[in-house]
């Protein structure tokens, strides 16, 4: 039941995330002018990752799109592959975790499958909220940069009488939904690997191939190369065995891929 | 056709009140930013306030501030201007002015103007 | 505030002649947004209201006469009447529309010779 719930809780709060990582993409307010100096501009100007907008005060928009690809910084590029990069693997995720869904039966999906798919798209989660907060992380820098750069130039060569105001630009809104979705999203990931684990059949229950021997049963167990850490007296990889009687059931039962994970 | 015609001028004593009224027909007033400009007997233009279309934004001068209001009845396509604490140097032509949508924050479109003299 | 100045004054010029009044601003009027300048020019004729003619320092309101032609960048602006006529004797004003307050130049009177 928890498992469940932990899986059904990551899988909202992922799709909340992803559905902020989308909605900060297409917001055009990523920059904002930085009215410190002049709270009452009648000309409001504000920036996104696709288009720059205008805001007067007679109520009248006007947006223009960057139609060129070449002439953008190469930061703004990347913040854009960022995010892109971020929904994707998110819609994908998104995609898997719904079929991974412990509430949703398909046809005969055993657990493990469930299992491995809950991962994955844990995984993926987990990458999308980091390229969205990596994303919008950099904007943020390059914000940051640029406002000192102009802060530096609008107090130098004023000596005469006519002053030419450079627009300096601070955080959007944009900016804090995508921190936000970002972090949502890695949660949401998080939580599904944490599923996941509840998910997966516990060692003590994994299936092993019995060989019959004439003598005695000697059962080979998957999973016996246990991976050594190099710090105990176990510096070498051992071959398990336990001897026994197996069921028919186990003679035909293999074991999964997610028991090598 | 666009209209404003503007009410309510007078003469006053310095410290009184007075409110004036800007009638708008011929037009979507909701959706305009409306302004009110003064000229003083000098003949120099004065912008003194203006209101945004919802009315959420409001911008005065500073040597108006604190003592006129403006405001606006959309439902009633009305501009108004509540002058309190008047003093002489406010005696001027008070104009209603439209602020055009895709004038870049110019006036397109002023009423005849109501005059206001303050004196004792 | 912006201030804008006007020059000259008052100017007298011969009908069919260049009519050509300067404004400039303490602060620059253009918007590196949308790369437009926010000036506006007005004409007001006795016991009249002023009637705006041209807007973001270049552009034609409609219905004025293309004989008025604004121009200019950041803070010096240029209204041009390139052949005066009769109707066009009146007091003509520049209008800072960037920043609040919407300041005003203090107007040039435009007379025949």
């Known amino acids: 039941m928890a498992v469940t719930a932990c899986q059904g809780l990551g899988f909202v709060v992922s799709l909340i995330g992803i559905a902020g990582i989308i909605a900060a993409t297409c917001m055009d307010q990523w920059s904002t002018q930085d009215l410190y100096n002049n709270p009452v501009t009648a000309v409001f100007n504000y920036q996104g990752l696709w288009r720059s907008c205008v805001r007067e005060s007679s109520g009248f928009t006007e947006c223009r799109g960057y139609f060129t690809l070449l002439g953008l910084p190469a930061m703004l590029q990347a913040v854009r592959a960022l995010m892109i990069v971020g929904i994707v693997l998110g819609a994908i995720g998104l995609l898997v975790s719904i079929f991974a869904l412990k509430c949703i039966r398909i046809g005969s999906m055993e657990d493990s499958a469930k299992a491995n798919m809950t991962l994955t798209s844990g995984i993926m989660f987990i990458v999308s909220g980091l390229c969205a907060i990596a994303g919008v992380s950099v904007f943020a820098n390059m914000l940051v940069t640029n406002f000192w750069m102009s802060t530096a130039n609008m107090y130098t060569g004023m000596g005469g009488m006519v002053q030419t105001v450079q627009t300096r630009y601070t955080f959007g809104a944009a900016l804090f939904v995508g921190w936000v979705a970002g972090g949502l999203t890695l949660i949401g990931g998080v939580m599904m690997c944490i599923a996941c684990r509840g998910l997966a059949p516990e060692e003590t229950n994994y299936k092993a191939v019995s060989y019959h021997a004439s003598g005695h049963s000697v059962a080979y167990k998957p999973g016996g190369f246990k991976a050594s850490t190099g710090f105990g007296s176990n510096t070498k990889n051992k071959k398990i065995y336990d001897g026994g009687a197996r069921t028919e059931d186990e003679v035909q039962s293999y074991p999964s891929k997610h028991d090598y994970v | 056709e666009v209209m404003l015609v503007e009410s309510g001028g007078g003469v006053v004593q310095p410290g009184g009140s007075l409110r004036l009224s800007c009638a708008a027909s011929?037009?979507?007033?909701?959706?305009?930013?409306m302004s009110w400009v003064r000229q003083t007997p000098e003949k120099r233009l004065e912008w003194v306030a203006t209101?945004?279309?919802?009315?959420?934004?409001?911008y005065y001068l500073d040597s108006v501030k604190g003592r006129f209001t403006i405001s606006r009845d959309n439902a009633k396509n009305t501009l108004y201007l509540q002058m309190n604490s008047l003093r002489t140097e406010d005696t001027a032509l008070y104009y209603c002015?439209?602020?055009?949508?895709?004038?870049?924050?110019?006036?397109?479109?002023w009423g005849q103007g109501t005059l206001i003299t303050v004196s004792s | 505030d912006i201030v804008m100045t006007q020059s000259p004054d008052s100017l007298a010029v011969s009908l069919g002649e260049r009519a050509t009044i300067n404004c400039k601003s303490s602060?620059?009027?253009?918007?590196?947004?949308?790369?437009?300048?926010?000036l506006a020019w007005y004409q007001q004729k006795p016991g009249q209201p002023p009637k705006l003619l041209i807007y973001?320092?270049?552009t034609r309101e409609s219905g004025v006469p293309d004989r008025f032609t604004g121009s200019g960048f950041g803070t010096d602006f240029t209204l041009t009447i390139s052949s005066l006529q009769a109707e066009d004797v009146a007091v003509y004003y520049c209008q800072n529309d960037h920043t609040y307050p919407l300041t005003f130049g203090a107007g040039t009177k435009l007379e025949i010779k």
């Open positions: 602060q620059s009027l253009f918007n590196s947004g949308n790369q437009k300048n926010y």
């Open positions: 973001g320092a270049s």
């Open positions: 002015a439209r602020m055009g949508l895709t004038q870049r924050n110019a006036l397109d479109y």
């Open positions: 209101i945004v279309g919802g009315g959420g934004y409001t």
């Open positions: 011929g037009f979507t007033f909701s959706t305009y930013t």
